[in-house]
């Protein structure tokens, strides 16, 4: 069992969904779990989040906000073998840019 490389970071806008892949070469029913190292608190043990969503072990986090920031790590286990762990993907949550003042309808501009 071995893991493919995962992206070092993922940038997602506030309120959007984050999709994390956990690519591995297991042909069997591998058990994928996801863990998070909290942003700004790297001395804590990783936090257990739960299983992946599909046979590929994708993690989907809906409606992300700033508190979702951190490093997301997947672990893959086949049977009772020791798990393999990804290097982790750092989730950056981006504030959407403010709407420009001039970005308004023609009707509003002409008032």
């Amino acid at each position: 069992l071995w893991m493919h490389k995962v992206p070092a970071s993922l940038m997602v806008s506030l309120g959007e969904d984050a999709h994390f892949q956990c690519p591995h070469n297991s042909s069997n029913n591998a058990n994928v779990t996801w863990w998070r190292v909290l942003h700004g608190n790297y001395t804590w043990p990783p936090e257990f989040l739960g299983p992946g969503e599909d046979p590929n072990g994708t993690l989907i986090i809906q409606n992300v906000n700033k508190s979702h920031g951190g490093i997301y790590v997947c672990r893959v286990q086949e049977g009772n073998e020791s798990y393999q762990q990804s290097c982790g993907t750092y989730l950056r949550v981006r504030q959407p840019p403010p709407r420009p003042f001039l970005d308004m309808g023609e009707g509003t501009k002409n008032r």
């Epitope: 779990t33 998070r36 990783p46 936090e47 992946g52 969503e53 986090i61 809906q62 992300v64 286990q77």
Partner: antibody
Framework: EVQLLESGGGLVQPGGSLRLSCAAS????????MNWVRQAPGKGLEWVSG????????YYADSVKGRFTISRDNSKNTLYLQMNSLRAEDTAVYYC?????????WGQGTLVTVSS | QSALTQPASVSGSPGQSITISCTGT?????????VSWYQQHPGKAPKLMIY???KRPSGVSNRFSGSKSGNTASLTISGLQAEDEADYYC??????????FGGGTKLTVLT
């Protein structure tokens, strides 16, 4: 502070239905797989059902498979358990819980009584 | 999904040490070491005492310790105190988002 608040319990007749809710606050709810765990009067803890963070994966104990449905509304930070075809042996306190690791959170539970 | 096996009851005098065992199969425990121990007083929700087999959450007394060897996990309470009298449950991750609990052990502190 993390809070999980269950509601919806009560007295129901055998064969009846009930829907439990669990309102979560103080945690990044959408990140976590969530679970329902129950405890019959004077008995031990029994895992009932689990759901992945986005709701794409659902899991059930054999004792409730086909009768109970777990779901979640991530826009409301709420977990649900729809319980149909209830039996006397489903009588228990039902806890909503995030299990595993140091971020392990439980509600105070809601009592479901199935009796005629 | 059979329950993990725990002794129904254990007892000890104040100041003594007791150990509660929790036995399962290799598929119950896997290699993730996601084994937790809970303390439950009557009418209360379970309280996490040990996570990942041997780690103590902040706020839990260092009189509580956990270990795991093969398919058996153990909880040891040293320097027994009256307030330790409660029910204790082990719990293990069993893949997907499924969990298995032990049948529970009633701890009596003899006075």
């Amino acid at each position: 502070e993390v809070q999980l608040l269950e509601s919806g319990g009560g007295l129901v007749q055998p064969g009846g239905s009930l829907r439990l809710s669990c309102a979560a606050s103080g945690l990044t709810f959408t990140s976590y797989a969530m679970n329902w765990v129950r405890q019959a009067p004077g008995k031990g803890l029994e895992w009932v059902s689990g759901i992945s963070g986005s709701g794409g994966g659902t899991y059930y104990a054999d004792s409730v498979k086909g009768r109970f449905t777990i779901s979640r509304d991530n826009s409301k930070n709420t977990l649900y358990l729809q319980m149909n075809s209830l039996r006397a042996e489903d009588t228990a306190v039902y806890y909503c819980a995030k299990l595993g690791g140091w971020s392990d959170y439980w509600g105070q539970g809601t009592l479901v009584t199935v009796s005629s | 999904q059979s329950a993990l096996t725990q002794p129904a009851s254990v007892s000890g005098s104040p100041g003594q040490s007791i150990t509660i065992s929790c036995t399962g199969t290799s598929s119950d425990f896997g290699s993730y070491n996601l084994v937790s121990w809970y303390q439950q007083h009557p009418g209360k929700a379970p309280k996490l005492m040990i996570y990942e087999g041997s780690k103590r959450p902040s706020g839990v007394s260092n009189r509580f310790s956990g270990s795991k060897s093969g398919n058996t996990a153990s909880l040891t309470i040293s320097g027994l105190q009256a307030e330790d009298e409660a029910d204790y449950y082990c719990c293990s991750y069993a893949g997907g988002s499924t969990w298995v609990f032990g049948g529970g052990t009633k701890l009596t502190v003899l006075t």
